[in-house]
């Protein structure tokens, strides 16, 4: 098995691939790529390697979260001499190789972006055969997914002493500002943002005491748009009905 010295450096910006006689391993990825939820994004990744004219079997891998150990979201394999990298894994069918690994390009397209795709991604290439070698991006590319606000839940809940409270949860990136409006609240009441632990895109605002019957409206807004939803409070002999 032929191995050559690996250079563990990684360029954080897409830099021009140099062509010295003794090429070293390196990977070029941008620090961040931004796109809107629902759209597609391209994660660029190009590499250099020391194995001139290598045309043996290769595997291209993209993983999420952390290098080396994170879950794979995409994997394809190309047979000796083939430029076709046959997909072996594409999580939810949304990942597709745009680049040609034979030409040192592992760029990946991600379709139908969701806020959950907002993670760091790492590209990796593996050679097998006469040459047994591999290299993986250590820093990766951060996919920043933006999204207009969407109210995911609005509800009226009982609270102590026969009172009621309203909760509104919205998602978006940037995290939306939430405001309540309703009877005796004036035009609107700004809510303090409270992103949930582990749910960075979710924001919840509470109206702790609903003192009047009527319609309560939650408005979520960020730089990409706004959304609103309402609940209705009707107290009949101490009972409540809520509808959105």
């Amino acid at each position: 098995f032929v191995r050559t010295k690996i250079d563990t450096t990684e360029n954080l910006l897409n830099t021009e691939v140099h062509s010295s006689p003794a090429q070293r391993w390196s990977m070029q990825v941008p620090p961040e790529v931004s796109a809107e939820a629902g759209d597609a994004a391209v994660l660029p990744c190009t590499f250099t390697h020391p194995h001139r004219h290598y045309d043996g079997p290769l595997t291209a891998i993209w993983r999420a979260g952390e290098p080396y150990a994170g879950p794979q979201v995409f994997r394809c394999a190309a047979a000796r001499g083939s430029e076709l990298c046959q997909t072996a894994l594409s999580l939810h069918g949304r990942f597709r190789l745009l680049g040609n690994p034979r030409r040192n390009d592992l760029s990946l397209r991600v379709e139908r972006l969701a806020l959950a795709d907002d993670r760091r991604y790492f590209c990796r290439v593996e050679f097998a055969g006469d040459v047994h070698d591999r290299y993986e991006s250590r820093h990766g590319v951060r996919l920043h997914v933006t999204a207009a606000p969407r109210i995911v839940n609005i509800s009226v809940l009982p609270s102590p002493a026969h009172a009621f409270r309203a909760l509104c949860t919205a998602e978006g990136e940037p995290p939306p500002a939430l405001a309540w409006s309703g009877p005796a609240l004036g035009n609107s009441l700004a809510a303090v943002r409270s992103p949930r632990e582990g749910h960075g895109h979710l924001v919840t605002a509470e109206l702790p005491a609903l003192t009047h019957d009527g319609r309560y409206t939650c408005t979520a807004a960020n730089s990409l748009g706004r959304s609103e939803a309402s609940v209705y409070l009707f107290r009949f002999h101490g009972a409540s009905g809520a509808s959105t």
């Epitope: 191995r3 250079d7 080396y68 150990a69 794979q72 894994l89 990796r124 593996e126 097998a128 591999r134």
Partner: antibody, heavy 122, light 107 residues
Amino acid sequence: EVQLLESGGGLVQPGGSLRLSCAASGFTFSSYAMSWVRQAPGKGLEWVSTISGGGGSTYYADSVKGRFTISRDNSKNTLYLQMNSLRAEDTAVYYCAKAIGSSWYSDAFDLWGQGTMVTVSS
Amino acid sequence: DIQMTQSPSSVSASVGDRVTITCRASQDISDWLAWYQQKPGKAPKLLIYVASSLQSGVPSRFSGSGSGTDFTLTISSLQPEDFATYYCQQSYSIPYTFGQGTKLEIK
């Protein structure tokens, strides 16, 4: 639960054969290279063999080349080691181990079975 | 083949001590090095991979460093459960090779 469970060890005479199995569960078996690593009594760890996720590439230590065959059945999530022409120096606990993060390479072994003892003696 | 040499082969230490184990490769292996812990009668357990990445679930008192030919495993403050044998392993090229082990004993 993510685990590996070896079986098939035992006492065998020199020149004999044995087939070890390793049943995997809790992860996508075909996505990872798998290996056998052994440890002679009171000694250190010795890599024996590795097979790629799809089974198309196999690698062996010189000490077992031509005598041992690694294989896998991805439909059964099972790894095998066929050991022929066994020698006294093959006496060891045999562990199966999963590669971290790759179907071709073992950057490290992040999951190990409990081991199965193989004793070669007359 | 790449030879991996660990030192010391054994070390005695007390709970709370800082312990360093070194591993030297016979040739440049970049950072393709892993560290394992093994207790008697048990399978090895991965601690560190790619020289310095801490395996999920491993306490942060364990750390790895180094690149090229010289590598170090450090336990910042020994706990009773850390007394075991530690192995380094190179995954730079086949055949994958392990160090001979370092036995960490209670002083």
